[in-house]
Interface confidence: low
């Protein structure tokens, strides 16, 4: 069953290469287990950036080496992607799955265009 997922259209990464955005889903049921996946779409290629499964009311747990962190509050997930560089500019899509209990629901957002601008190198000072 399809589920609506909302996310901002555009986000500008900080000078330190950090971008944050909220992914909100319209839950049709009382899910206890939710999976959130961030996908990056660039040049018609879609790759998985990170994914986390969490129990409602608990923190999101990404893999230790993940570039993502996040917190959840109700039907909102606050996602932060770190270590971004200019070449990482692209459309970041939020995918939410209500894993448990059945029935399974899947929602895919329209994507957040994240713009990353590499900071200008500091001029050498004598």
């Amino acid at each position: 069953k399809a589920m609506h997922v909302a996310q901002p259209a555009v986000v500008l990464a900080s000078s330190r290469g950090i971008a944050s955005f909220v992914c909100e889903y319209a839950s049709p049921g009382k899910a206890t287990e939710v999976r959130v996946t961030v996908l990056r779409q660039a040049d018609s290629q879609v790759t998985e950036v990170c994914a986390a499964t969490y129990m409602m009311g608990n923190e999101l747990t990404f893999l230790d080496d993940s570039i993502c962190t996040g917190t959840s509050s109700g039907n909102q997930v606050n996602l932060t992607i770190q270590g971004l560089r200019a070449m990482d500019t692209g459309l970041y899509i939020c995918k939410v799955e209500l894993m448990y209990p059945p029935p399974y629901y899947l929602g895919i957002g329209n994507g957040t265009q994240i713009y990353v601008i590499d900071p200008e190198p500091c001029p050498d000072s004598d």
Epitope: K1, A2, R35, T37, E48, A51, T53, K95, E97, M99, Y100, P101, P102, P103, Y104, Y105, L106, I108
Partner: antibody
């Protein structure tokens, strides 16, 4: 080796009831969502019911909702399907199926039993 | 419910042939599609899930492709044991529905 063995099929009159069983072995039964899928003679496959790992949550298509009840006994590694108010169109081979999950955790039917035939006829 | 349409319904081919079966979804199901093989009097057997991932123990002559609404199952070189009926099934949420089947017969 995963094994699913259905039983309980047979001939029943329209309006009657039947209870199917599926004995599971070769895996940790309580760790998997389970389902029933049916196939009318010479026809395609139709999902009938799904039950969560602990048995607290169930799901049905509209065609059987309110008439069929899926349940499980994890202590006995057994899945059940209670079928009431049976109709001629419920005549089919009923398969018990174990669900599996990929990286995205979407469900498909990874293992199937051999099936048990239910015939609803006067 | 998402309607799944398979074509052709019947297909005649010879051992060694390359065959392709098509499955169309009534709406976008991304890559959430499975393929099953069923022989007469037997239970279905999972071949492919997530549109292109081969299930354990399935020969590499089977392959799946597609996304969105159009999917294909290809058998690169038919073997005698491949003559069977093939079903597609979306696993994009509930209720999961199957295609009508494609019966692959010996020419």
């Amino acid at each position: 080796e995963v094994q699913l063995v259905e039983s309980g099929g047979g001939l029943v009159q329209p309006g009657g009831s039947l209870r199917l069983s599926c004995a599971a072995s070769g895996f940790t039964f309580s760790s998997y969502t389970m389902s029933w899928v049916r196939q009318a003679p010479g026809k395609g496959l139709e999902w009938v019911a799904t039950i969560s790992r602990g048995g607290g949550y169930t799901s049905y298509p509209d065609s059987v909702k309110g008439r069929f009840t899926i349940s499980r006994d994890n202590s006995k590694n057994t899945l059940y399907l209670q079928m009431n108010s049976l109709r001629a169109e419920d005549t089919a081979v009923y398969y018990c199926a174990r669900e599996d999950y990929g990286s995205s955790y979407v469900h498909w039917f990874a293992y199937w039993g051999q099936g048990t035939l239910v015939t609803v006829s006067a | 419910d998402i309607q799944m349409t398979q074509s052709p319904s019947f297909l005649s081919a010879s051992v060694g042939d390359r065959v392709t079966i098509t499955c169309r979804a009534g709406e976008n199901i991304y890559s959430y599609l499975a393929w099953y093989q069923q022989k007469p009097g037997k239970a279905p057997k999972l071949l492919i899930y997530n549109a292109r991932t081969l299930a354990e123990g399935v020969p590499s002559r089977f392959s799946g492709s597609g996304s969105g609404t159009e999917f294909t199952l290809t058998i690169s070189s038919l073997q005698p044991e491949d003559f069977a009926t093939y079903y597609c099934q979306h696993h994009y949420g509930s209720p999961r529905t199957f295609g009508g089947g494609t019966k692959l017969e010996i020419k």
